[in-house]
């Protein structure tokens, strides 16, 4: 960053997205400001509008092309400028030589469902957006249900530590709603983080069967 | 990369308004900050106005500000130029330019353009 009071962090989707975030303090909120990517060994440049988040951070989305088009490589390096406008002028305000796999952070997965349902187990599936084919199978999954009564930061975590878009629940309660959330995070990358959680897949156990224990 | 197609030029009298249109094809569509430009017969092509790709922020060359504006729906895929008390040195032919390098989009030579459309004001 040019300056102590400023942090500006990015991660790429591993195909064609980076997100920044950029804070500063006592930064305007009404100043015009864009990310600007300068790859080393591309022919595009790009830019994005960052909109404000909170009181003194901001957000935008370099969209490098289609959803599933795989804009960089791991011998790529972008370098991402922050520039605000002063005046007439335009201020280089943070800048970082970004190298796309050392800072990976794959979309939510999606396409939850539900497999199939019994009263004491549940098998889900889903499926990884817009993630490298360069992954081939090195990539981890966490997971987490939602019981009655409690909440997301009070489920264990279960860890799947291969490629496996799918888990069989067990030990569950009959005649039950639960909640289920699933991340997703390559091996790839030393500043590499987990994506954000899938939206919550809600499904119910079946009711045990009259006159069993 | 991205085809850009401009509509909605004509003949007015000045102090008339015109709305143009330019629809934005093959690629996706909010990378690009979008500008118009024009030339008059025998003048060189000019700046008009652009609008960032989140539509937040919107330049003007000075000679149309307050009667124009500039605008996009990124879910239509178009941008717009709202012409408004148009007067007789507004007559020029009309182009959109796409660039996803905002710095770069009164680049004439870098820009991706349409095929413009003709704007005449009439006294």
């Known amino acids: 960053a040019v300056n102590g009071t400023s942090r500006f962090t990015c991660f790429y989707n591993s195909r064609a997205n980076i997100s920044c975030v950029w804070s500063q303090d006592g930064a305007l909120q009404d100043t015009s400001c864009q990310v600007h990517a300068w790859p080393d060994r591309r022919r595009w440049n790009q830019t994005c509008e960052l909109l404000p988040v909170s009181q003194a951070s901001w957000a935008c989305n370099l969209i490098l092309g289609t959803p599933d088009s795989q804009k960089l490589t791991a011998v790529d390096i972008v370098t991402l400028r922050v520039m605000c406008r002063e005046g007439v002028r335009w201020r280089m305000m943070a800048i970082q030589d970004f190298k796309p796999f050392e800072n990976l952070r794959l979309m939510a997965p999606i396409s939850l469902q539900v497999v199939h349902v019994e009263t004491h187990r549940c098998n889900i599936s889903w499926k990884i957006s817009q993630a490298s084919h360069y992954f081939e199978r090195h990539l981890e999954f966490e997971a987490r249900t939602l019981s009655p009564g409690h909440t997301w930061e009070e489920a264990p975590l279960m860890t799947l530590k291969q490629k496996q878009e799918w888990i069989c629940l067990e030990t569950l309660t009959p005649d039950t709603q639960y909640e289920f959330q699933v991340r997703v995070k390559p091996l790839q990358g030393e500043f590499t983080t987990w994506s954000p959680w899938s939206q919550p897949l809600a499904f119910r156990t079946k009711p045990a069967a009259l006159g069993k224990d | 990369q991205v085809q850009l197609q401009e509509s909605g030029g004509g003949l007015v009298q000045a102090g008339g308004s015109l709305r143009l249109s330019c629809a934005a094809s093959g690629d996706v569509f909010v990378r690009y900050t979008m500008a118009w430009f024009r030339q008059a017969p025998g003048k060189e092509r000019e700046f008009v106005a652009s609008?960032?790709?989140?539509?937040?922020?919107?330049e003007y060359v000075d000679s149309v500000k307050g009667r124009f504006t500039v605008s996009r729906d990124n879910a239509k895929n178009t941008a717009y130029l709202q012409m408004n008390n148009l007067k007789p040195e507004d007559t020029a032919i009309y182009y959109c330019?796409?660039?996803?390098?905002?710095?770069?989009?009164?680049?004439?030579?870098?820009?991706?353009w349409g095929q413009g459309t003709q704007v005449t004001v009439s006294s």
């Open positions: 330019a796409a660039n996803t390098d905002y710095f770069q989009i009164r680049s004439l030579d870098l820009n991706t």
């Open positions: 609008v960032t790709d989140s539509g937040r922020t919107t």
